[in-house]
């Protein structure tokens, strides 16, 4: 808002741009015939200091020279970096009511001379790109500073370009717009950056480079893969590259992997054969390029090619298990179960399974295909049967897995001994056993089978199983193991043509049951009372029930109740007691016990025995 200095002038010594820490003298002079009317001697010149348009100081006390009514000189010190505005005003002291009138103003810039630019780095992206150089300018100068980038090279040529830094923009990179072509591969270039401002100048050290040092090839493009004869393990990776590329780096990995396979290819000319791919696997491929075998820089990685390798026929063998159930005197139901192949064995989408049941002597064969992982058939109880299953994808089928159908628990001498089940943590159970004592034939393998002891589990849910080599006597089961659920666990010992088994119940974690059994009836037969109950609902059992307790006491008695403990059997739902007095009314109830403790009591029932007491 200074009115173009009509009243006078302001000058700065030594200059309006000064180094940090320097002092300056600001002189304010009135033009002839300007000033306070009537009393020139009453002219008072004052100097005001503004930073960011805010008045910060009246420099009245900093006068070092005064021509009364005509000019004044002020010394300013301790100026901070950047720009400071000084405004000279005329104060007519005989008129207190009028504010001081602006005379003129000046801006003083405080800064530092530029440091020599450092760490110059030049890059040309691609054979057709242009040279761009960047550098570190050093400390901020707080002044407008001009930078000149100068590139000298062959053909007696020098290229230069300028930019500047100030408080609004920073200059530490310039694109010269010129392309270095491969015919200059042997040539040397020298680059330097010069910085200059009002307080001085400085130059970087010269930095020398060659074409190969600075040209970074563009990443390869148009990547594709061709699978030879639709092979799932062999493919030719193809891509487009800049003409001068002599070295490529390939990296590839299955999509769910965390480590890359790396390959270096010299003079690949946009083609490379890969031989170790996994069939039917989603892969990611990327390629990088270099213009020189020893020097130069790698390009950025190309965009990823994501593709799935073709299928190949399944390998590996299916893990088969079965259940036998007699239907009547001459028929049995065979249910076959098998586990899906893992992806590296399936090597494609399994379309179906080929299942065969064969009676060995009569050569009867039942064949079928199914998409499921189980198959049930009714067959005669006579004869020796064998089953086989193979998995098929679009390229072929796996080798069939054979299993002899034997009576799984038919040979007591093959039953494993001392079977135990211990909870290891929330989701697994350690099963241990001892080998059969007097087996007629050698144990070929053990099968540990388990299923949740819940209503309908045999029909609704397939079993889970683990195959264990004959010299192992333990298994950690974890598949589909949940806490607070009781599992029936069977350990089968299988020989060539026989089977023996032992059974145990186990859980991975247990709590006391939520409730006790519900007494449904009390009946008296032959001087004994029979207590009947319904089992605790499955979700409320909270683990394996070890035993039930029946409690009774006389109706109004305060004495401790008597109790009878019954080993838990799922098939049992009544039990006799015989120590009650006739014609005395009793209250009875039941509880259930797991390894974690006893449930609350179930419902109470009153009963008065009529018969003769023992």
């Amino acid at each position: 808002n200074i009115d173009v200095c009509k009243l006078g002038t302001v000058t700065v010594q030594p200059a309006p741009v000064i180094p940090l820490g320097s002092a300056a003298n600001i002189s304010c002079s009135l033009n002839p015939k300007q000033g306070c009317s009537h009393y020139p001697s009453s002219n008072e010149l004052i100097l005001l200091k503004f930073v960011n348009d805010v008045l910060v100081e009246n420099l009245h006390g900093k006068k070092v020279h005064d021509h009364t009514g005509h000019s004044s000189t002020f010394q300013v010190t301790n100026l901070s970096l950047g720009m400071t505005l000084f405004v000279c005003k005329l104060n007519c002291s005989n008129s207190q009511k009028k504010p001081p009138v602006p005379v003129c103003g000046v801006e003083i810039s405080v800064g530092v001379a530029p440091e020599p630019p450092q760490n110059i780095s030049c890059v040309q992206e691609g054979e057709n790109g242009t040279v761009a150089c960047s550098w570190n300018s050093g400390k901020v100068t707080y002044l407008k500073t001009n930078y000149t980038l100068q590139l000298s090279g062959p053909n007696n040529l020098t290229c230069q370009k300028q930019c500047f830094s100030d408080n609004r923009q920073n200059c530490n990179r310039l694109d010269l717009g010129i392309n270095l072509s491969p015919d200059l591969a042997e040539s040397r270039f020298i680059v330097r950056v010069t910085a200059i401002n009002d307080l001085g100048n400085s130059s970087s050290l010269p930095h020398t480079f060659t074409f190969l040092d600075i040209v970074i090839p563009l990443p390869p493009w148009d990547i594709r893969i061709n699978f030879l004869n639709a092979s799932g393990s062999r493919g030719t990776l193809q891509w487009e590259d800049e003409g001068q590329v002599v070295l490529n780096q390939l990296r590839y990995q299955p999509l769910n992997s965390t480590s890359w396979n790396m390959v270096n290819a010299t003079n690949a000319k946009g083609k490379y054969d890969l031989r170790d791919l996994r069939p039917f696997t989603e892969y990611e491929f990327q390629i990088s390029s270099k213009l020189h075998l020893s020097g130069g820089s790698w390009s950025n990685w190309s965009e990823s090619l994501r593709t799935r390798t073709p299928e190949e026929e399944p390998v590996g063998i299916l893990d088969i298990w079965y259940m036998k159930q007699d239907i009547d005197y001459d028929r049995q139901q065979i249910s076959l179960f098998w586990k899906s192949l893992n992806p590296s064995e399936a090597r494609g989408k399994i379309l179906h399974y080929q299942v065969t049941l064969q009676e060995v002597t009569k050569k009867t064969t039942l064949q079928n295909t199914t998409r499921h992982t189980s198959w049930t058939r009714v067959i005669p109880r006579t004869g020796a049967w064998t089953a086989s299953v193979s998995a098929a994808n679009s390229k072929g089928a796996s080798a069939p897995t054979h299993i002899n159908i034997v009576d799984l628990c038919g040979t007591g001498l093959l039953a494993p001994h001392q079977v135990s089940a211990k909870s290891e943590n929330m989701d697994n159970i350690l099963v241990t056993w001892q080998p059969p004592k007097k087996a007629d034939s050698a144990v070929r393998e053990y099968i540990v089978e388990w299923r949740a002891l819940q209503p309908g589990s045999i029909t609704k849910f397939p079993p889970h199983w683990l195959r264990i080599p004959p010299d192992n006597m333990s298994a950690l089961i974890s598949e589909n193991i949940k806490p607070y659920i009781c599992y029936e666990i069977r350990v089968h010992a299988l020989s060539e043509s026989q089977g023996g088994c032992s059974s145990i119940r186990g859980d991975s974690k247990h709590k006391a049951p939520v409730s006790g059994p519900h007494i449904t009836a009390i009946t008296e037969k032959k001087e004994r009372l029979f207590i009947s109950w319904t089992h605790i609902p499955f979700p409320e059992q909270r683990g394996c029930i070890l035993h039930y307790r029946i409690y009774w006491k006389e109706r109004d008695s305060t004495a401790q109740p008597e109790l009878c403990e019954i080993q838990y059997r799922r098939s049992q739902n009544s039990h006799p007691i015989s120590s009650l007095q006739p014609r005395v009314t009793y209250v009875l109830w039941m509880t259930a016990v797991t390894a974690a403790g006893e449930s609350p009591q179930g419902n109470e029932r009153e009963f008065c025995p009529q018969g003769k007491a023992n």
Epitope: N128, T130, G153, P154, N155, N156, L157, C159, Q160, K161, Q162, D175, L176, G177, I178, N179, L180, S181, D183, L184
Partner: nanobody, 127 residues
């Protein structure tokens, strides 16, 4: 039709200065390089300086670096060559020339790569 018109030549004493102008017409040269070449009697045409409009980069041959300065006025489609500290060996006919992309280091200083040429202006440095 593209035309390049030089002006500003003349006789000057050694150590003196001259400013040559080259006005281009017939098309815009925003992607071009406009340069100055010179040819002394009995010698081949040689590169002096050039300006790459789009990048703002200047090019100089070693013998004039620090003495000559090239600049341009995009609004007027004109390139200037400020020549200071002139020497007798700077005497030549000065030609204005323009080239289309691509702009390669190998091409900038070579006259065959320039498609458009002016008629030339004589510069004589003599006492």
């Amino acid at each position: 039709q593209v035309q390049l018109q030089e002006s500003g030549g003349g006789l000057v004493q050694p150590g003196g200065s001259l400013r040559l102008s080259c006005a281009a017409s017939g098309r815009t040269f925003s992607n071009s390089v406009m340069g100055w070449f010179r040819q002394a009697p009995g010698k081949e045409r040689e590169f002096v300086a050039a300006l790459m409009w789009s990048a703002g980069s200047e090019f100089y041959t070693d013998s004039v670096k620090g003495r000559f300065s090239i600049s341009g006025d995009g609004a007027k489609n004109t390139v200037y060559l400020q020549m200071n500290s002139l020497k007798a060996e700077d005497t030549a006919v000065y030609y204005c020339a323009a080239k289309n992309p691509p702009h390669r280091w190998s091409d900038i200083g070579k006259s065959p790569h320039y498609e458009y040429w002016g008629q030339g202006t004589q510069v004589t440095v003599s006492s």
